[in-house]
């Protein structure tokens, strides 16, 4: 026997209280699939959240963050404060990166400068709070008679906060 509720399309629910007829989702709710016995409450984008996509009877609202904040978590479940480049967010707010670390984004953590000597290279450009060091050719490559200069290694890309 086919479930009569399977005929109810997205945007409706199968009303247990009215002989399982398909009723439209009430305001501020949605059903994104057919055959639902309840419509779900729309997400509301309040406070630091702003509406990226309005809720409809067939799809939930989508939020992003107001300027000065960025999304974290699945579906932008949280908004985290932006910091400046050269800073990271701590429990006490934005703090400058410690010496020897950098952050070239408005989010995420300060990361250690690349250690050029581990690759047998020299420091071509010193690091700052906002930028990683740029490693140059190895000292051997700079000796007289060396036929070519190794191109500088690319600056390491810092990790992102989870999205």
């Amino acid at each position: 026997l086919q479930d009569p509720c399977s005929n109810c399309p997205a945007g409706t629910f199968c009303d247990n209280n009215r002989n399982q007829i398909c009723s439209p989702c009430p305001p501020n709710s949605f059903s994104s699939a057919g055959g639902q016995r309840t419509c779900d409450i729309c997400r509301q984008c309040k406070g630091v959240f702003r509406t990226r996509k309005e809720c409809s009877s067939t799809s939930n609202a989508e939020c992003d963050c107001t300027p000065g904040f960025h999304c974290l978590g699945a579906g932008c479940s949280m908004c985290e404060q932006d910091c400046k480049q050269g800073q990271e967010l701590t429990k006490k707010g934005c703090k400058d990166c410690c010496f020897g670390t950098f952050n070239d984004q408005k989010r995420g953590i300060c990361r250690p400068w690349t250690n050029c000597s581990l690759d047998g290279k020299s420091v071509l450009v010193n690091g700052t709070k906002e930028r990683d060091v740029v490693c140059g050719p190895s000292p051997a490559d700079l000796s007289p008679g060396a036929s070519s200069v190794t191109p500088p290694a690319p600056a390491r890309e810092p990790g992102h906060s989870p999205q």
Epitope: D15, N16, N28, Q36, R37, T38, C39, I41, Q44
Partner: antibody, heavy 121, light 106 residues
Framework: QVQLVQSGAEVKKPGASVKMSCKAS????????MHWLKQAPGQCLEWIGY????????NYNQKFTDRATLTADKSTSTAYMELSSLRSEDTAVYYC??????????????WGQGTTVTVSS | EIVLTQSPDFQSATPKEKVTITCRAS?????IHWYQQKPGSSPKAWIS???NLASGVPSRFSGSGSGTSYTLTINRVEAEDAATYYC?????????FGCGTKLEIK
């Protein structure tokens, strides 16, 4: 008959987490949404959020988004709420309550007996 | 969020008296639900969608109202009606409750 049976009282230290359960019987678990509410001593009832056991969809009161996690196990008809980073203000009775979403009225027609959570160092 | 303000906070009544409890919303809502709670017990569904009595609720109870003003009325109050009554809305997320009216029967 329709029943919601909640897990027993808990005593926790600040910063800890607690996970409580709500076992449903006497009805089809996936046909109704399950809500969680907080009643702190001398405070108003507060809605924490709900889960639709059929789809797993959750919707939270923004006040609790960061610390409450709602889940449901269809195989055992049990809903769960985990509350993390506990603080003294979380000392309260927590209720699960069923809502017949198909009435579109979001009315809590059946309530659990409550789980008392005490947060104390 | 929509704030529900109940009045009075506390009411003392004598048996057979008529009791009226009011719930005012900070902005218009589609309907109000009412719950009864006795000490040491969970809240119980009492009136849904403004005026529909839950199963087993005596007919001396009634509910009415619209927009921002709703009332629960007990026509001839009895001793067993001593409890705290809460109103609740969901016209806007999140669900919110009034802080309750405690009814004492002398």
């Amino acid at each position: 008959q329709v029943q919601l049976v909640q897990s027993g009282a808990e005593v926790k230290k600040p910063g800890a987490s607690v996970k409580m359960s709500c076992k449903a019987s006497g009805y089809t678990f996936t046909f109704y949404t399950m809500h969680w509410l907080k009643q702190a001593p001398g405070q108003c009832l507060e809605w924490i959020g709900y889960i639709n056991p059929s789809s797993g969809y959750t919707n939270y009161n923004q006040k609790f988004t960061d610390r409450a996690t709602l889940t449901a196990d269809k195989s055992t008809s049990t809903a769960y709420m985990e509350l993390s980073s506990l603080r003294s203000e979380d000392t309260a009775v927590y209720y699960c309550a069923r809502s017949d979403g198909s009435s579109s009225k979001w009315y809590f027609d059946v309530w659990g007996q409550g789980t008392t959570v005490t947060v104390s160092s | 969020e929509i704030v529900l303000t109940q009045s009075p906070d506390f009411q003392s009544a004598t048996p057979k008296e008529k009791v009226t409890i009011t719930c005012r919303a900070s902005s218009s809502v589609s309907y109000i639900h009412w719950y009864q709670q006795k000490p040491g017990s969970s809240p119980k569904a009492w009136i849904s969608a403004t005026s529909n009595l839950a199963s087993g609720v005596p007919s001396r109870f009634s509910g009415s109202g619209s927009g921002t003003s709703y009332t629960l009325t007990i026509n001839r109050v009895e001793a067993e009606d001593a409890a705290t009554y809460y109103c609740q809305q969901w016209s806007s997320n999140p669900f919110t409750f009034g802080c309750g009216t405690k009814l004492e029967i002398k």
